[in-house]
């Protein structure tokens, strides 16, 4: 089996409004070479949430926690969550191409639901 695996271990995450949401993603290899991006939604209308190589994403930070020998952590945290952030988030590996990078493999997705802020 040649393909790396994209592992999004949590099918769903629930976060209170105003809190931060951690979206986990691990990959089994850096090969094939290419960037990793996060999107909300799938298909042509998906929204880019984070691309480390370019862009400005002030609410997103990267969170690499426990380092395991057999995989690589590409998790993110989104701060100050609002109900508008609800949706399914995908961690996507691209393969470096010319002239454009090619989508290689996507994680299964993590559904983010937003609870009302505790009063």
């Amino acid at each position: 089996e040649d393909e790396l695996q994209v592992i999004q271990p949590e099918k769903s995450v629930s976060v209170a409004a105003g809190e931060s949401a951690t979206l986990r993603c691990a990959m089994t290899s850096l090969i094939p070479v290419g960037p990793i991006m996060w999107f909300r939604g799938a298909g042509a209308g998906r929204e880019l949430i984070y691309n480390q190589k370019e862009g400005h994403f002030p609410r997103v930070t990267t969170v690499s926690e426990l380092t395991k020998r057999n995989n690589l952590d590409f998790s993110i945290s989104i701060s100050n969550i609002t109900p508008a952030d609800a949706g399914t988030y995908y961690c996507v590996k691209f393969r470096k191409g010319s002239p454009d990078d090619v989508e290689f493999k996507s994680g299964a997705g993590t559904e983010l639901s937003v609870r009302a802020k505790p009063s």
Epitope: D2, S29, I31, P32, S64, N71, F74, S75
Partner: antibody
Framework: EVQLVESGGGLVKPGGSLRLSCAAS????????MSWVRQTPGKGLEWVAT????????YYPDSVKGRFTLSRDNAKNSLYLQMNSLRAEDTAVYYC???????????WGQGTTVTVSS | DIVLTQSPASLAVSLGERATISCRAS??????????MHWYQQKPGQPPKLLIY???NLESGVPDRFSGSGSRTDFTLTINPLQAEDVATYYC?????????FGGGTKVEIK
């Protein structure tokens, strides 16, 4: 015990060819990215080539691109580096190395010496 | 290409003392909080051996007197306390971007 055993090195004239082999044992070869790294007294360690676990993707630095070809046979737990149009600057000890995640080099063979000289 | 500059080129340290080796990258080797910088030990006549992976993680079987630290462009390998069997040349290596590159090496000797 992990073992990587290189072979195929030797003396070759400039413009000539050599085929290096690496026999792997003690780990699941087909799950690992594999690479060659060479070492010279003058230039130190230099990455030479990398191949994905299934053999679909290969990567080379500009210094060897178009001259070297990396392949693998997972059924035989073997890695091969075909080196053509050899130059004096290709003279080095060539190490076979494994990479579980395609990142750090986990295990290295003992190396095989390639000498390019007229 | 990412250039890795190791310093010093050679280092003489007394047994039981601390040896510190620096590796500076010409650009960041960090991605998503991972630092793709690794350290190897090479003894004469032997291949390199992985000591530290991804900046600070000790490879299995490596004594805990070896440690790594740093992020982005500045990394350090520390040996404390130095033992006689640690006499070797140490190399840093980045796998953040192709072509993968190595530092020029630091030779550690006993004072």
């Amino acid at each position: 015990e992990v073992q990587l055993v290189e072979s195929g090195g030797g003396l070759v004239k400039p413009g000539g060819s050599l085929r290096l082999s690496c026999a792997a044992s003690g780990f699941t070869f087909s799950s690992y990215v594999m690479s060659w790294v060479r070492q010279t007294p003058g230039k130190g360690l230099e990455w030479v080539a990398t191949i994905s676990s299934g053999g679909t993707y290969t990567y080379y630095p500009d210094s060897v691109k178009g001259r070297f070809t990396l392949s693998r046979d997972n059924a035989k737990n073997s890695l091969y580096l075909q080196m053509n149009s050899l130059r004096a600057e290709d003279t080095a000890v060539y190490y076979c190395a494994s990479q579980l995640t395609g990142s750090e080099f986990d295990y290295w063979g003992q190396g095989t010496t390639v000498t390019v000289s007229s | 290409d990412i250039v890795l500059t190791q310093s010093p080129a050679s280092l003489a340290v007394s047994l039981g003392e601390r040896a510190t080796i620096s590796c500076r990258a010409s650009e960041s080797v960090d991605s998503y909080g991972n630092s793709f910088m690794h350290w190897y030990q090479q003894k004469p006549g032997q291949p390199p051996k992985l000591l530290i992976y991804r900046a600070s993680n000790l490879e299995s079987g490596v004594p805990d007197r070896f440690s790594g630290s740093g992020s982005r462009t500045d990394f350090t390998l520390t040996i404390n306390p130095l033992q006689a069997e640690d006499v070797a040349t140490y190399y840093c290596h980045q796998s953040a971007d192709l072509p993968w590159t190595f530092g020029g090496g630091t030779k550690v000797e006993i004072k």
